[in-house]
């Protein structure tokens, strides 16, 4: 049994880091493998993560963490029984993938304006809470070419757009994702999408 693709890990900078790797053949990850992780810090102890299968030869492990600070560094040991398959380290602050925003809502009752709001995925005491920026993706269910991205570079988790910038009388979907420049993070996963029917009063044409 050998590791074909070494573990790579990302942290949500809150309570979970996710490590993925591939074995050289079909593996029952949860029964055959264990990933031990230990904070490099005085009096810390090793903790065990039981991996799950992620495709035939792929494994994924969700490492629970109390919280994360920039100084944290972990040692990682991948074991198959008594055999050490791989040894490495992981600094969560250098491999951050933010949590996806939630509760995306489209408010259509504002006159001729669409107000999209969503929730910041972090509590106020988390460092990322005040450092997230967002990308909002809006697309038409009827027209695949009608696909647009709005970059939200301010902290407020909301976006206002004129309803008239979208076609009237058809359905649209929206989703939102986040990233944090301060830690040069990757983008989060997209939030679940929300759907609405876009309709607005056409301006009266004068001849």
């Amino acid at each position: 049994m050998k590791v074909l693709q070494e573990p790579t890990c990302v942290s949500d900078y809150m309570s979970i880091s996710t490590c993925e790797w591939k074995m050289n053949g079909p593996t029952n990850c949860s029964t055959e493998l264990r990933l031990l992780y230990q904070l490099v810090f005085l009096l810390s102890e090793a903790h065990t993560c039981i991996p799950e299968n992620n495709g035939g030869a792929g494994c994924v492990c969700h490492l629970l963490m109390d919280d994360v600070v920039s100084a944290d560094n972990y040692t990682l040991d991948l074991w198959a029984g008594q055999q050490l398959l791989w040894k490495g380290s992981f600094k969560p602050s250098e491999h951050v993938k933010p949590r996806a925003p939630g509760n995306l809502t489209v408010h259509t009752n504002v006159s001729d304006t669409l107000l999209l709001t969503w929730s910041n995925p972090y509590p106020p005491d988390n460092y990322l809470y005040n450092h997230l920026t967002y990308a909002v993706n809006i697309w038409s269910e009827n027209d695949p070419a009608d696909f647009r991205i709005y970059n939200v570079t301010y902290l407020e988790p909301s976006l206002r757009i004129a309803a008239s910038t979208l076609k009237s009388g058809i359905s649209y979907r929206a989703r939102v994702r986040a990233w944090a420049q301060c830690y040069n993070t990757t983008w989060s996963e997209w939030s679940p999408s929300t759907k609405w029917h876009n309709s607005y009063r056409e301006p009266f044409e004068q001849h």
């Epitope: 005085l42 009096l43 102890e45 963490m65 109390d66």
Partner: antibody, heavy 125, light 112 residues
Framework: EVQLVESGGGLEQPGGSLRLSCAGS????????MTWVRQAPGKGLEWVSS????????YYADSVKGRFTISRDNSKNTLYLQMNSLRAEDTAVYYC??????????????????WGQGTTVTVSS | DIVMTQSPLSLPVTPGEPASISCRSS???????????LDWYLQKSGQSPQLLIY???NRASGVPDRFSGSGSGTDFTLKISRVEAEDVGFYYC?????????FGQGTKLEIK
């Protein structure tokens, strides 16, 4: 009530051995690291050794490394300090203290928040 | 090893007056924001040490609010807003960031 009670001190000749014990009660003993601190007569406090909750990690002051061994029996809620090759400069009151919560991923630190009453070790010929 | 230096080493105080003890470390005790591994202990005559302040500024359970700790990095202070007769004894700062844990020399607080 959270409590630590030391025992095992006494008079010993240079080169001799003693085993100190520290019995814990009122808290989940195995969840916490434990620490030994000593105080020579008329002197300040000196850290001696620490051990993690499971006993897997141990740390020693250079002055006792290779001579003292810290250990614990979590089934008995007891901490030990085996002292070999004793020297006159080991003469001190030895305190055990409750250290950080090591069951957590990052050990939670609340200071050395509980101390025993101390046990006196005298090394003299 | 991290060297801890306390001052003053002797502190005569009139009851009801404030008192302040300084502690400096030879390297930063700041693991990260909110994690300065610096404690303050009081040892009264003939007794075991007792914890006053942990992580630089957190008052231990049962410690009167006249005791407060502050500082970060390498400079720390213990303040007693109004000294009482029962506060006499030796005050020690201690770093617990790395082993060996190291203590300051101790400050003897006495009543004038």
């Amino acid at each position: 009530e959270v409590q630590l009670v030391e025992s095992g001190g006494g008079l010993e000749q240079p080169g001799g051995s003693l085993r100190l014990s520290c019995a814990g009660s009122g808290f989940t003993f195995s969840d916490y690291a434990m620490t030994w601190v000593r105080q020579a007569p008329g002197k300040g406090l000196e850290w001696v050794s620490s051990i993690s909750g499971s006993g897997s990690n141990t740390y020693y002051a250079d002055s006792v490394k290779g001579r003292f061994t810290i250990s614990r029996d979590n089934s008995k809620n007891t901490l030990y300090l085996q002292m070999n090759s004793l020297r006159a400069e080991d003469t001190a009151v030895y305190y055990c203290a409750k250290d950080r919560l090591t069951i957590a991923i990052r050990p939670y630190y609340y200071g050395l928040d509980v101390w025993g009453q101390g046990t006196t070790v005298t090394v003299s010929s | 090893d991290i060297v801890m230096t306390q001052s003053p080493l002797s502190l005569p105080v009139t009851p009801g007056e404030p008192a302040s003890i300084s502690c400096r470390s030879s390297q930063s005790l700041d693991y990260s924001i909110g994690y300065n591994y610096l404690d303050w202990y009081l040892q009264k005559s003939g007794q075991s040490p007792q914890l006053l302040i942990y992580l630089a500024s957190n008052r231990a359970s049962g410690v009167p609010d006249r005791f407060s700790g502050s500082g970060s990095g390498t400079d720390f202070t213990l303040k007693i807003s109004r000294v009482e007769a029962e506060d006499v004894g030796f005050y020690y700062c201690m770093q617990a960031l790395q082993t060996p844990y190291t203590f300051g020399q101790g400050t003897k607080l006495e009543i004038k």
